[in-house]
């Protein structure tokens, strides 16, 4: 009689992590009697998988009832499987011995690779606010896939971006990677509504890659212009001043009026108008009792936006001439204006 | 093509450790032995142990008290320590790669670093 | 330990010539499975070693048909049909049946 083989007919399988693995292994004849055993690896180190004789292996099963006198399929499944069963599995066949039942017949092992998905990529950005012109950075992360092969691309409002620099880690063999990546951004005005994506491809995705954003409204701040105009006058003795704030992100504002370096009120930000490209603009009205003052006075608005040093921008009011109107330099966005009149 | 690459102080003084590491380049730690053998000047090799792929050691008696083989595969490295070194431990070290796929035994330490000389002298 | 003892020595060559090498060991390398786990290696001057032969007559990737190993159980021999200059140095016969691995002391193959 032809002498028993041992066959593997999968050189290879594919697996997602999570999922059961099939191994196949059938024998060719029922002699010599013996058990069979599943090894991952071989040599002195291998480690034993499951053992048709004894022992416990409770994330094993076999395909086919091998308690049955003709069996020949010893095929077996793996359940739960993660990157770290990766590797060659070897059926082996054992002739019964006394004491112990001696190795016989090995087939030629069925590699094992484990897929495993990238976590959805985190994005971050600065830890602190940059203004306009300014390069910031961003890093993108994505965790515990395998293989290591993985794509990532990096967009700014759908454009791609090339500036960014890319590691997976480790530089080695492992059983799952991570990738992380650093864009360099350079912020603009209109970067109120813009997006950072970082884009991650891998073959376990499908072809449909996983994203991460970060809105660069987290990250810009846009300073404010100022102007100052003063008013037609209101009545005999009164000049309207107005502080206008356009263009400033994000909206966090606080505004100080001084009349000759003295503060005269101070007010923060409340009812803001938004542009289209996400800026606000504020205006703040200061109504002046000229009859107060014997010498011209000196006006000034003083605006401290988000935590940073304050700007102002003054304006010379003539308290000697009679008080006319002075062109009103309104613009059509600066229709929500701050109407409270505290002197 | 895969290649080792020993590094290493090249001069240990008496009673000191010896710290080698192997490199592997261009292929898989997986499914291997990673093996250190020596050869004093002259003289024959000398197996000194390997590390599987799972990390499983298996080491020479004769200097199993004082050898240790590790096993970085994130760094794609490998590493022989031996402690309380003496002028018989002078050598050329190797690094290898052993083949393992039919049953308990080896089928050929196949991939050789260059060796590294190691001095042991005070 | 199993011990590896080779033979001869040294072996002066003539190129072109055959040659032999004697590898045994100290109990059988014949594994149940039918597999004799022996190697042979070649070191050339200042060179590492080579593998030859593994699993007592299986070449290795890459060397030529002239290198052939033979034997079973306790007794192994390497033949060389034709001896070329190139394969001057010396011999190792390794068991990789069990730890610790153990090579022979060496073949010495010279140019007459």
């Known amino acids: 009689e032809e002498e028993l083989q041992v066959i593997q007919p999968d050189k290879s399988v594919l697996v997602a992590a999570g999922e059961t693995a099939t191994l196949r292994c059938t024998a060719t004849s029922l002699i010599p009697v013996g058990p069979i055993q599943w090894f991952r690896g071989a040599g002195p180190g291998r480690e034993l998988i499951y053992n048709q004789k004894e022992g416990h292996f409770p994330r094993v099963t076999t395909v086919s009832d091998l308690t049955k006198r003709n069996n020949m399929d010893f095929s077996i499944r793996i359940g739960n499987i993660t990157p770290a069963d990766a590797g060659t599995y070897y059926c082996v066949k054992f002739r019964k011995g006394s004491p112990d039942d001696v190795e016989f017949k090995s087939g030629a092992g069925t590699e094992l690779s484990v897929r495993a998905k990238p976590s959805a990529p985190v994005v971050s950005g600065p830890a602190a606010r940059a203004t306009p012109q300014h390069t910031v950075s961003f890093t993108c992360e994505s965790h515990g896939f395998s293989p290591r092969d993985i794509t990532l691309k990096w967009f700014k409002n759908g454009n791609e971006l090339s500036d960014f620099q890319t590691n997976v880690d480790p530089v080695g063999e492992s059983v799952s990677y991570s990738i992380h990546s650093t864009a360099k951004v350079v912020l603009t005005r209109e970067d109120v509504h813009s997006q950072v994506i970082c884009e991650v491809a891998h073959v376990t995705l499908q072809g449909d890659p996983l994203r991460g954003t970060a809105n660069l409204s987290e990250t810009i701040r846009v300073p404010p212009t100022l102007e100052v105009t003063q008013q037609p006058v209101r009545a005999e003795n009164q000049v309207n001043v107005t502080c206008q704030v356009r263009k400033f992100y994000p909206q966090r504002l606080q505004l100080t009026w001084l009349e000759n370096g003295n503060v005269s009120r101070t007010e923060t930000a409340s009812t803001v108008t938004e542009n289209k490209d996400g800026t606000y603009n504020w205006m703040s009205w200061l109504l002046v009792n000229v009859s107060a003052h014997r010498d011209d006075v000196k006006l000034t608005c003083q605006v401290e936006h988000d935590g940073q040093p304050a700007v102002s921008k003054s304006h010379d009011l003539k308290v000697s001439a009679h008080p006319k109107e002075q062109g009103s330099n309104t613009a059509a966005e600066n229709t929500g204006s701050n109407e409270r009149n505290i002197y | 093509q895969v290649q080792l690459q020993e590094s290493g102080p090249g001069l240990v003084r008496p009673s000191e450790t010896l710290s080698l590491t192997c490199t592997v380049s261009g292929g898989s730690i997986r499914n291997y032995y990673w093996s250190w053998i020596r050869q004093p000047p002259g003289k024959g090799l000398e197996w000194m142990g390997f590390i599987y792929d799972n990390g499983r050691t298996f080491y020479n008696p004769s200097l199993k008290s004082r050898v240790t083989i590790s096993l970085d595969m994130s760094m794609n490295q490998f590493s022989l320590k031996m402690t309380s070194v003496t002028a018989a431990d002078t050598a050329v070290y190797y690094c290898?790669?052993?083949?393992?796929?039919?049953?308990?035994?080896?089928?050929?330490?196949?991939?050789w670093g260059q060796g590294t000389t190691v001095t042991v002298s005070s | 330990d199993i011990v590896m003892t080779q033979s001869p020595l040294s072996l002066p060559v003539t190129p072109g010539e055959p040659a032999s090498i004697s590898c045994k060991s100290s109990?059988?390398?014949?594994?149940?499975?039918?597999?004799?786990?022996l190697d042979w290696y070649l070191q050339r001057p200042g060179q590492s070693p080579q593998l030859l032969i593994y699993?007592?007559?299986n070449r290795a990737s890459g060397v030529p048909d002239r290198f052939s190993g033979s034997g079973s159980g306790t007794d192994f021999t390497l033949k060389i049909s034709r001896v070329e200059a190139e394969d001057v140095g010396v011999f190792y016969c390794?068991?990789?049946?069990?730890?610790?691995?153990?090579f022979g002391g060496g073949t010495k193959v010279e140019i007459k």
């Open positions: 390794m068991q990789a049946l069990q730890t610790p691995l153990t």
């Open positions: 290898a790669r052993v083949r393992a796929y039919s049953g308990i035994g080896l089928d050929g330490t196949d991939v």
């Open positions: 109990q059988s390398l014949l594994y149940s499975n039918g597999y004799a786990y």
């Open positions: 699993q007592g007559s």
